[in-house]
Structure formats: C-alpha cells, structure tokens
C-alpha cells in the first residue's frame, strides 16, 4: 500500500512539476526593467525566453518576438535547450510512470517490469527538474552579471554616443516558477525511485542447513515472510521432525520467488 | 549597434517653420522613448519634447502649442514640427533614443550627432 501511495504521489508531484516548467518556459516574465531616466512616461519592460515586452503607464503594451533577431546571446539560447530538454525529458517520464503505475493493470505486465519503467521515469523526472533548475539559475546569473557590469560603458559612433540608461531590474515570476516547478519534478523523480525499490524486492534464494539433533534428526528451514503481507507458502520457522534425516530437497516447502530473509 | 541621424536643420527666420526628423538604424530590435534634446551655445542641454512607443507625448513649458513631435514606429523615424520659431530657439537639436537590447538584457540610450536650428533674421 505504502509503495502504491510513494508511486501516485510522486507521479503527481512531477506532473505538477512538468505543468510548472512548460508554463515557466512560455511566460514573458523572465526578467522585467522599469526605465528610469525617462521623461516621457513609465515605461515597464518584460522579457521572456521568445520575446520581450513593453508596457508603458498609459496603458500601451507591445510585445516582438525574437525569431529574427540576430545576436541573441549563447546563453540564452543555452536557458532555452535546457528548458525544452526538461520538458521533453519530463513528457517522456510521465508516459512511461503511467504505465508503470501499480494500480493500473496493463495485460500480464511483471511486477519486475513496472519497477524498471518506475524507475526509468523517476531518473527522467530527476534529470527534468534539474536542467528547469539549472536553465532558470542560468537565466538569473547572466541577469544579475549584465547589471553588475559597470553602467559607464559607452562608446561612440557617427559622433553621437550609445550609454547604457539606469534601470532597475528584478527577477520575473517565471523564474520562480520555473524553480519550484523543477524542485517538484526532482522530489517526484526521487519519490518514484524510492517505490521502485519497494516494488522489486531482491530476489535471492537461501539453501536451507541440515541440522542433526541427537535422537532425533531435525530438517530446520529458516522461513522467509512475503513483502507487504502476512501470507504465503512459509511465513514462520518451521522445524521438520521424523525420524530419519533428510535432505532440503526433500522437505516439502512451497517458496515464493518474493520471499527472502 | 544603433546609430541616429538628425536632418532638417537650418537657417529659419523668427516666426518661420522647419521640420527635423531623426532615423534610427543599425541592430534595432525596439526603441521605447524617442526625445529632442537642445543646447544653445554655452549652456546645458535642455529637453524639448518627448514621445514614447505608444504615443505618449511630453513637452518643455517654453516649447508646449508650437512644436509637435510624432513618430514612425514601423520606420523607427522621429519627426519635430517647430512653428512659429523664435531666436531663442536657436540651438543644435539632439535625438535621443532608450533601445532594449536583448542581447545584454538592458536599455541602451542612443545619442545622435545633432543638428543646428539658427533663427535669424
């Protein structure tokens, strides 16, 4: 039951996760500057990973994408990669924990089975929500590096002059977004892999010793106790007498292939 | 990197006319606030008008019912109707432009080379 609960909760967690990346990648608020030296009207700006925005006090707001725009940064295009990388990683998580899911029978799939592909999703969850991290940690980095940079730096040309103006910027929501979207889908991961354990019990077989008493031979089996449950072939110790020896193979016992020590 | 180019000055008498206009060029990807800037010889350059991507217009007290200024967004040109023109506005006029550029994440402010307006009779 516990292992079913891990598996849904983690599924949930990282579909929560993986809506949070996909909204965090197509938000406009990756970044947003308020103009200062301005003596026209407030201007507000607003930038995302496709196009920046513009919205001024008197209600004017435009939008431009950067589809033709040369130059855009290496790193930036770099926030992207590691976005779509971890949406595509994550969509691929999702697909395969659905049928990985306990509570969902499909055909004769092995119990061995679906812990590989709960597996396999939780990795994919894992590596989702650390390139969402890693590609919005980037972001601010180049953010807060471009602002730190000495605003005295200017150069001329054709006699007139290019300065960089006095903003003030913050960090937009979407970079918040994006890094509780992918903490959720690296705790989904984690969860995911935790009930994999739990699904796939090692399986090992342990030869049971031939103890002799004096008098009377005694076959001593030590029993094994299913996983999760109180049944199965040989849930106690059980201590064979007769009165001749005899081998482990011929005492009559039913093992389960779950059932270790 | 973006350059500005002023045109339409000159010599005008008091109470003439003259249009200035001022092109934006270069890696553009959007102006915001487009200004005129003048500095009449030995003294400090002054702001004259002002307006922004949506329309948004300001103008200096001394300069407000005779100059108009407009733009062209698609052909990222500023334009300074000056009426009724008077020697003190006699000046070099100043385009100013405040860019955003993606590529470093700021605004960049543009200045052109300027024009001289001479009002005389």
């Known amino acids: 039951m516990a292992v079913t609960a891990c598996q849904g909760l983690g599924f949930v967690v990282s579909l929560i996760g993986i809506a949070g990346i996909i909204a965090a990648t197509c938000m406009d608020q990756w970044s947003t500057q308020d103009l200062y030296n301005n003596p026209v009207t407030a201007v507000f700006n607003y930038q995302g990973l496709w196009r920046s925005c513009v919205r001024e006090s008197s209600g004017f707001t435009e939008c431009r994408g950067y589809f033709t725009l040369l130059g855009l940064p290496a790193m930036l295009q770099a926030v992207r990669a590691l976005m779509i990388v971890g949406i595509v990683l994550g969509a691929i998580g999702l697909l395969v924990s659905i049928f990985a899911l306990k509570c969902i029978r499909i055909g004769s799939m092995e119990d061995s089975a679906k812990a590989n592909m709960t597996l396999t999703s939780g990795i994919m969850f894992i590596v989702s929500g650390l390139c969402a991290i890693a590609g919005v940690s980037v972001f601010a980095n180049m953010l807060v590096t471009n602002f730190w940079m000495s605003t005295a730096n200017m150069y001329t040309g054709m006699g007139g002059m290019v300065q960089t103006v006095q903003t003030r910027y913050t960090f937009g929501a979407a970079l918040f977004v994006g890094w509780v979207a992918g903490g959720l889908t690296l705790i989904g991961g984690v969860m995911m892999c935790i009930a994999c354990r739990g699904l796939a019990p090692e399986e090992t077989n342990y030869k049971a010793v031939s103890y002799h008493a004096s008098g009377h031979s005694v076959a001593y089996k030590p029993g094994g106790f299913k996983a999760s449950t109180g049944f199965g072939s040989n849930t106690k110790n059980k201590k064979i007498y007769d009165g001749g020896a005899r081998t482990e193979d011929e005492v009559q016992s039913y093992p389960s292939k779950h059932d270790y020590v | 990197e973006v350059q500005l180019v002023e045109s339409g000055g000159g010599l005008v008498q008091p109470g003439g006319s003259l249009r200035l206009s001022c092109a934006a060029s270069?890696?553009?990807?959007?102006?915001?606030?487009m200004g005129w800037y003048r500095q009449a010889p030995g003294k400090q350059r002054e702001f004259v008008a002002g307006?922004?991507?949506?329309?948004?217009?300001n103008y200096a007290h001394s300069v407000k019912e005779r100059f108009t200024i407009s733009r062209d967004n698609a052909k990222n040109t500023m334009y300074l109707q000056m009426n009724s023109l008077k020697s003190e506005d006699t000046a070099g006029y100043y385009c100013?432009?405040?860019?955003?550029?993606?590529?470093?994440?700021?605004?960049?402010?543009?200045w052109g080379q300027g024009t001289l307006v001479t009002v005389s009779a």
């Open positions: 100013n432009a405040q860019a955003w550029d993606p590529g470093t994440i700021r605004y960049l402010e543009v």
């Open positions: 270069g890696n553009i990807f959007r102006i915001d606030t």
């Open positions: 307006i922004s991507r949506g329309g948004s217009t």
